[in-house]
Interface confidence: low
């Protein structure tokens, strides 16, 4: 049987001779050279050689456990003369014994990490890891311990885990943002003689909202013309915040001051500026200077830093309103005037007044906008604003005249204002009533006396205050011996009545009745209208059957003896 144990061989042998491994030996070996030892398997004949007479095994090269920790070989012992095995072929192991020849190596050459500024001591930052190629099962060659070479007193590292934590209170990004920490990993449990490796950890403090906004100046002054429309930007203010990003965002608001209702502040998201804008129309003559208290605040506040004070700041903004030459202002938005239609030319109707609202109180002149008075019926005294007629009026042609008066600053003609004038023309009884239509009627030959043959209506262009009251009568020249009578109905109508029984159309075919219509106003106006009455043959129902058409065709020579 074979006589050996497991072979052990120290790695990294540096001697000048071959390294002795061990001896293969069979109990059949009598020492007379009759046996021959043969080696086969991992590295046989190359890494490992055997003395075939003695069975001594030697390693020819330096071995590295980290490259190959175990070699499996086979041993044979054969009789030289017969060539037959004297022992069964047997497998054996050469185990490479570890020495501490590898330093710990970090998984990254450089680590980057972030941690919020102002973090509590002991806040986790990052974990670094180093590995050692030596045998962890034997000795302390692969037992790694972490320590900090650079980065104190700001950071610490847990020796066993490689966890880096904050070590200093109130680390302030605004003071210092970047830290370079060097960590060492040492084997042999950190003891003397251990091998070591290092890594760099670049740590950045991230921002938290630990700084309030601050105005660089306590007072700002801006100017704006009084003519600035609402929405006009008049100035920009900017508070600075040492924080960054969301934590440096600023909202502006007006918190106090007599300009609170007159101005607005809007936040420019891109520049983080507060833009002061006009909110309501300004008036230099009413108020020349406004003061505002403007506040800049962080919209996102971290409650744990409130002890540092309010996260806002305020500044005073003084706004000076500049005078702008404004147009004149009329005493009314519109004027309503009245004038009788019988007014003579140059009759004064009324007056308008306008004043320059500016401090200078520039004098104004007045004029009529000719586009609104194309017929030049009215005129104005350019100095005092008196309106007067320049043509005769007629209410019946136009009841209302709508004109525009312009007031212009004498020193600055570009400054002008306009006002509407509504002029009502009052009625005067200057029109006579007239028939509402042309009246031509007929009477039957067999008509009875006092029969109504026509109702008369009248119209009058005038418009008396108490309404129309017309009276009707036969003209004096036709009143005596007339064949017809006029009956005034006292309701602005009248009837034509027959005055006799029967008419003879052969005797008189047509009658012309002159009727006087008067109104009841002052001065009384009247007119005479003529009604034509034709005598016709009628049936027993009173329906006209025939008349002398010649009466219409040849009106000459007709009798007026109505």
């Amino acid at each position: 049987s074979w006589m050996w144990n497991q072979f052990f061989l120290l790695e990294e042998y540096t001697g000048s001779d071959y390294q002795y491994v061990g001896k293969l030996h069979s109990d059949q070996d009598r020492g007379d050279g009759s046996l021959k030892y043969i080696l086969s398997g991992d590295g046989a004949g190359d890494l490992f050689i055997i003395n075939e007479n003695t069975g001594d095994i030697q390693a020819t090269k330096r071995l590295d456990r980290e490259e190959k920790p175990v070699y499996i070989l086979r041993a044979q012992a054969i009789n030289r003369r017969t060539g037959r095995p004297v022992e069964p072929e047997s497998e054996f192991i050469i185990k490479i014994h570890d020495i501490n020849d590898n330093e710990p190596i970090f998984t990254k050459e450089v680590y980057t990490a972030t941690v919020p500024e102002m973090s509590d001591v002991g806040t986790f930052v990052v974990q670094v890891t180093a590995t050692d190629a030596d045998d962890p099962t034997y000795g302390n060659s692969a037992k790694v311990v972490y320590s900090i070479l650079q980065g104190q007193p700001y950071f610490s590292v847990e020796s066993e885990t490689g966890i880096i934590k904050t070590a200093l209170l109130n680390m302030d990004r605004e003071n210092r943002e970047q830290y370079q920490v060097v960590i060492q990993a040492k084997d042999m449990g950190g003891q003397m003689g251990g091998l070591s490796g290092t890594t760099t950890v670049n740590i950045t403090l991230t921002d938290v909202n630990d700084n309030p906004p601050r105005f660089p100046q306590s007072t700002y002054q801006f100017k704006t013309p009084e003519s600035s429309p609402p929405g006009t930007p008049i100035g920009r203010i900017k508070a600075s915040d040492a924080d960054v990003g969301e934590n440096a965002e600023i909202e502006y608001s007006i918190t106090d001051g007599e300009g609170l209702d007159m101005f607005d502040v809007i936040t420019d998201q891109e520049t983080q500026e507060g833009i002061i804008t006009v909110k309501k129309l300004l008036d230099f003559e009413k108020k020349k200077v406004y003061t505002l208290k403007v506040e800049a605040s962080n919209p996102y506040v971290e409650p744990r830093f409130l002890y540092l004070g309010p996260f806002k700041d305020s500044a005073t903004v003084r706004i000076v309103v500049e005078d702008v030459d404004e147009p004149p202002v009329f005493s009314k938005l519109a004027y309503i005037l009245q004038i009788r239609e019988d007014a003579q030319i140059n009759t004064t109707i009324g007056s308008v007044t306008a004043q320059d609202p500016d401090a200078a109180r520039n004098p104004v002149k007045y004029s009529v906008d000719r586009h609104t008075d194309m017929d030049r019926i009215f005129n104005i005294d350019s100095g005092n604003g008196s309106i007067f007629t320049s043509k005769l009026l007629d209410r019946e042609t136009l009841l209302w005249h709508n004109i525009t008066v312009i007031a212009t600053e004498i020193n600055n003609p570009k400054q002008s204002s306009r006002v509407p004038l509504y002029i009502k023309v009052l009625d005067v009884n200057d029109n006579a009533p007239e028939f509402a239509e042309f009246y031509e009627t007929f009477v039957c030959e067999k008509a009875k006396a006092d029969q109504l043959i026509q109702t008369l209506h009248a119209v009058d262009k005038d418009d008396p205050y108490s309404g129309h009251q017309f009276s009707f009568s036969l003209a004096p020249e036709a009143a005596s011996g007339s064949n017809f009578t006029i009956q005034d109905n006292k309701d602005n109508t009248a009837g034509i009545l027959t005055r006799k029984n029967g008419y003879n159309r052969h005797e008189m075919s047509t009658y012309l009745l002159p009727v006087v219509i008067s109104d009841n106003d002052y001065p009384v106006q009247s007119s005479t209208g003529t009604v034509t009455v034709r005598v016709c043959a009628c049936d027993h129902h009173g329906n006209m059957q025939s008349c002398h058409a010649e009466a219409l065709i040849h009106p000459t020579g007709l009798s007026t003896g109505a």
């Epitope: 013309p225 003519s227 600035s228 429309p229 929405g231 006009t232 930007p233 702008v324 570009k414």
Partner: antibody, heavy 119, light 107 residues
């Protein structure tokens, strides 16, 4: 939405007149002044005048006083501009436009009518 | 009439560049100024009013400024779609008047 519709083109002979239309929709027609603007080929913009659709009141650029007459038809929400005594100098694109916002700036425009004066 | 003098009449710029167009009024127009963009064959479009207020929907790269008689519009980081003619317009006094226009081309 607010729209101003104008015919695309008008071809007229020298000496004649043309009446351009601008039909408004999507807003109260009588509530906003209607403006007209001229643009000659390759040139800038010129303001012709404005009309108040409520009462027909107008403000006109003196330069166009004898050339353009502005009218409206409230029943059809349409504004008109009549151009008279046309010459080749009057060939241009004519836009109607309104100031729909709170300020005196033209924020809604018609597509424009191209007037070509040629015999 | 108030004269509006616009400059330059034309310019060419590369994508990403910033350009400035100016308008000078012949008298103080107190912020009553608008800027319009007109693309080839199209109606003008309002960009900025009240001298510096951006119309809804207009990109923030268009920036208006100025007061009194001097006004300008800056276009930051020019894009290909900014190829157009730009006009200023005063509505301070009748008749309303426009600048002569600035034609912007992209190189």
């Amino acid at each position: 939405q607010v729209q101003l519709q104008q015919p695309g083109a008008e071809l007229v002979k020298p000496g004649a007149s043309v009446k351009l239309s601008c039909k408004a929709s999507g807003y109260t027609f009588t509530g906003y002044w209607m403006h007209w603007v001229r643009q000659r080929p390759g040139q800038g913009l010129e303001w012709i005048g404005e009309i108040n659709p409520n009462n027909g009141g107008t403000n006109c650029n003196e330069q166009f006083k004898n050339k353009a007459t502005l009218t409206v038809d409230k029943s059809s929400s349409t504004a008109y501009m009549q151009l008279s005594s046309l010459t080749s100098e009057d060939s241009a694109v004519f836009y109607c436009t309104i100031s729909f916002g709170n300020y005196l700036f033209f924020d809604v425009w018609g597509a424009g009518t191209t007037v070509t004066v040629s015999s | 009439d108030i004269q509006m003098t616009q400059s330059p009449a034309s310019l060419a710029a590369s994508v990403g560049e910033t350009i400035t167009i100016t308008c000078q009024a012949s008298e103080n127009i107190y912020f009553s100024l608008a800027w319009y963009q007109q693309k080839q064959g199209k109606s003008p479009q309002l960009l900025i009013y009240n001298a510096n207020t951006l119309e809804d929907g207009v990109p923030s790269r268009f920036v208006g400024s100025g007061s009194g008689t001097q006004y300008s519009m800056k276009i930051n980081s020019i894009q290909p779609e900014d190829t157009a003619t730009y006009f200023c317009d005063q509505t301070y006094d009748f008749p309303w008047t426009f600048g002569g226009g600035t034609k912007l081309e992209i190189k």
